[in-house]
């Protein structure tokens, strides 16, 4: 009983339950392959509890192992469109600080119009995650088709 | 030591560890695009700890942020079948209460025979999740090919 | 405050936070469809906290429900390659002990060059997970394209 009370009294953040789910805000100019994200209750079902957005990119606030997941659907797409515009590739990586820059997750669309995946990875406070969509096709902004999120799993 | 003992004495449900993994039971009649699910140890590796099934649809019992995941494989399928029967689409959403009805996750098969994805989303006690498979193709009932689950992540 | 202190003093392992993320080490000879994995900080972003590797296969050390996830990308691949070499299939299963042998997760590549999925499943101490890639195509060893992991979710 004492534990249950203690757990309720502690702020959730002290338990390390950092979590975020983002929806697509916009794409960058032609030379910038990054997707720009947004989140918050006013926008629907997206949220940030712990991590923050820095110019549309997700910045981590707590060290730990995270589950990173993403789904991106191309906006005007059929299997012929996807194969004709190949290679269209989505990569999720740490883009800053530069010393920690690395690609974490990479998928090509080939003849499909949606990619979805997830992985466990260590992240550190201050790491900024970027999602790069290379190719000429544009992503869908529908919130059930394109989203990106992280979940703190353990220290 | 006191914490470890307390943790063991508390029922898991009070820690908020609601989780479910379901296997396909059957599809509905022609006009009903919903997939009907089942779960329980007698059925193999499916289970419900917290959430419940209501006429084959998953009902949430605890407010919180959940990781929702799904994989659906089409039963008699090749890339030519999939493209010929396009669009075959899978959508996961809250179907009741009607006031909270929304699509959470949507994927099309295009030239593939399997879709798989996952996302974080807030769910409330009483929310019922429906999985709609639109198109003429039938899903595989193999438990390693078609499954649907949720995991409570945080309040 | 007492809980927070107690939580910090307890080893993480006692909280049941077993987790592993592996990268591809090598493939076996033609007759052996298994993928052989490796993990550890010296290898980059892979790790094992709780589970262990036994001859390149992942062995579970704690009973519980786990989230199992995998992504495999074919090394030399285009949508035509994938369809021409069909069926190329990836299956994740318990391969030992033999009494618990079962396929947990199965996907075919069809016209795609990457498969990615995840599922919740009960696993027991001593269960060894094998990932079988059937077909003639070889997987990519790039750490952002091919990976396999598990995360303990609850008892």
């Amino acid at each position: 009983q004492r534990f249950a009370q203690a757990q309720q009294q502690l702020p959730l953040e002290s338990l390390g339950w950092d979590v975020a789910e983002l929806q697509l805000n916009h794409t960058g100019p032609q030379q910038d392959p990054r997707l720009y994200w947004q989140g918050g209750p006013a926008l629907g079902r997206s949220f940030l509890h712990g991590p923050e957005l820095d110019k549309g990119q997700l910045r981590i606030h707590r060290d730990g192992i995270y589950m990173v997941h993403i789904q991106v659907t191309l906006a005007i797409c059929s299997s012929t469109t996807a194969s004709r515009h190949h290679p269209t590739t989505l990569a999720v990586g740490i883009c800053s600080p530069a010393s920690r820059s690395i690609s974490l997750l990479r998928l090509s669309f080939h003849q499909g119009c949606t990619i979805a995946s997830q992985r466990l990875t260590p992240l550190a406070r201050g790491d900024t995650l970027c999602t790069n969509l290379t190719g000429t096709l544009l992503p869908s902004r529908n919130t059930d088709e394109t989203f990106f999120g992280v979940q703190w799993v353990r220290p | 030591q006191r914490f470890a003992q307390a943790q063991q004495q508390l029922p898991l449900e009070s820690l908020g560890w609601d989780v479910a993994e379901l296997q396909l039971n059957h599809t509905g009649p022609q006009q009903d695009p919903r997939l009907y699910w089942q779960g329980g140890p007698a059925l193999g590796r499916s289970f419900l700890h917290g959430p419940e099934l209501d006429k084959g649809q998953l009902r949430i019992h605890r407010d919180g942020i959940y990781m929702v995941h799904i994989q659906v494989t089409l039963a008699i399928c090749s890339s030519t079948t999939a493209s010929r029967h396009h669009p075959t689409t899978l959508a996961v959403g809250i179907c009741s209460p009607a006031s909270r009805s929304i699509s959470l996750l949507r994927l099309s098969f295009h030239q593939g025979c399997t879709i798989a994805s996952q996302r974080l989303t807030p769910l409330a006690r009483g929310d019922t999740l429906c999985t709609n498979l639109t198109g003429t193709l039938l899903p595989s009932r193999n438990t390693d090919e078609t499954f649907f689950g949720v995991q409570w992540v945080r309040p | 405050q007492r809980f927070a202190q107690a939580q910090q003093q307890l080893p993480l392992e006692s909280l049941g936070w077993d987790v592993a993320e592996l990268q591809l080490n090598h493939t076996g000879p033609q007759q052996d469809p298994r993928l052989y994995w490796q993990g550890g900080p010296a290898l980059g972003r892979s790790f094992l906290h709780g589970p262990e590797l036994d001859k390149g296969q992942l062995r579970i050390h704690r009973d519980g429900i786990y989230m199992v996830h995998i992504q495999v990308t074919l090394a030399i691949c285009s949508s035509t390659t994938a369809s021409r070499h069909h069926p190329t299939t990836l299956a994740v299963g318990i391969c030992s002990p033999a009494s618990r042998s079962i396929s947990l997760l199965r996907l075919s590549f069809h016209q795609g060059c990457t498969i990615a999925s995840q599922r919740l499943t009960p696993l027991a101490r001593g269960d060894t997970l094998c990932t079988n890639l059937t077909g003639t195509l070889l997987p990519s060893r790039n750490t952002d394209e091919t990976f396999f992991g598990v995360q303990w979710v609850r008892p």
Epitope: - | - | Q23, N25, H26, T27, G28, P29, Q30, D32, Q38, A42, L43, G44, L138, R141, T143
Partner: nanobody, 116 residues
Framework: QVQLQESGGGLVQPGGSLRLSCVAS????????MNWYRQAPGKQRELVAI???????DYADSVKGRFTISSDNAKTTVYLQMNSLKPEDTALYYC??????????WGQGTQVTVSS
């Protein structure tokens, strides 16, 4: 450190053959894969053939049935036998060695030109 030295490139007529060699020297251990890549002018580097430690091979669609990758018994030399060469095979061919611990080593490249 591992050094890779390719040889065997040159000018050949369409339909002809060449055999590329790549000799690895230095501290060679724990080889996971030996690969041949190629890069044509103005194009991305392309993975052409793989030989893994268990002797399994894989090829790009464009060369399948024409190219064969192999190695000597000591696995210190990897070969690429190229038959029925076409003008589109013209490129700089690179040998690549991947270790189990994810270290990549590259040769300087050998030029193959297919022209009549």
């Amino acid at each position: 450190q591992v050094q890779l030295q390719e040889s065997g490139g040159g000018l050949v007529q369409p339909g002809g053959s060449l055999r590329l060699s790549c000799v690895a020297s230095g501290s060679i251990f724990s080889i996971a894969r030996m690969n041949w890549y190629r890069q044509a002018p103005g194009k991305q580097r392309e993975l052409v053939a793989i030989l893994n430690r268990a002797g399994r091979t894989d090829y790009a669609d464009s060369v399948k049935g024409r190219f064969t990758i192999s190695s000597d018994n000591a696995k210190t030399t990897v070969y690429l036998q190229m038959n029925s060469l076409k003008p589109e095979d013209t490129a700089l061919y690179y040998c690549n060695l991947q270790t189990i611990s994810y270290h990549d080593f590259w040769g300087q490249g050998t030029q193959v030109t297919v022209s009549s």
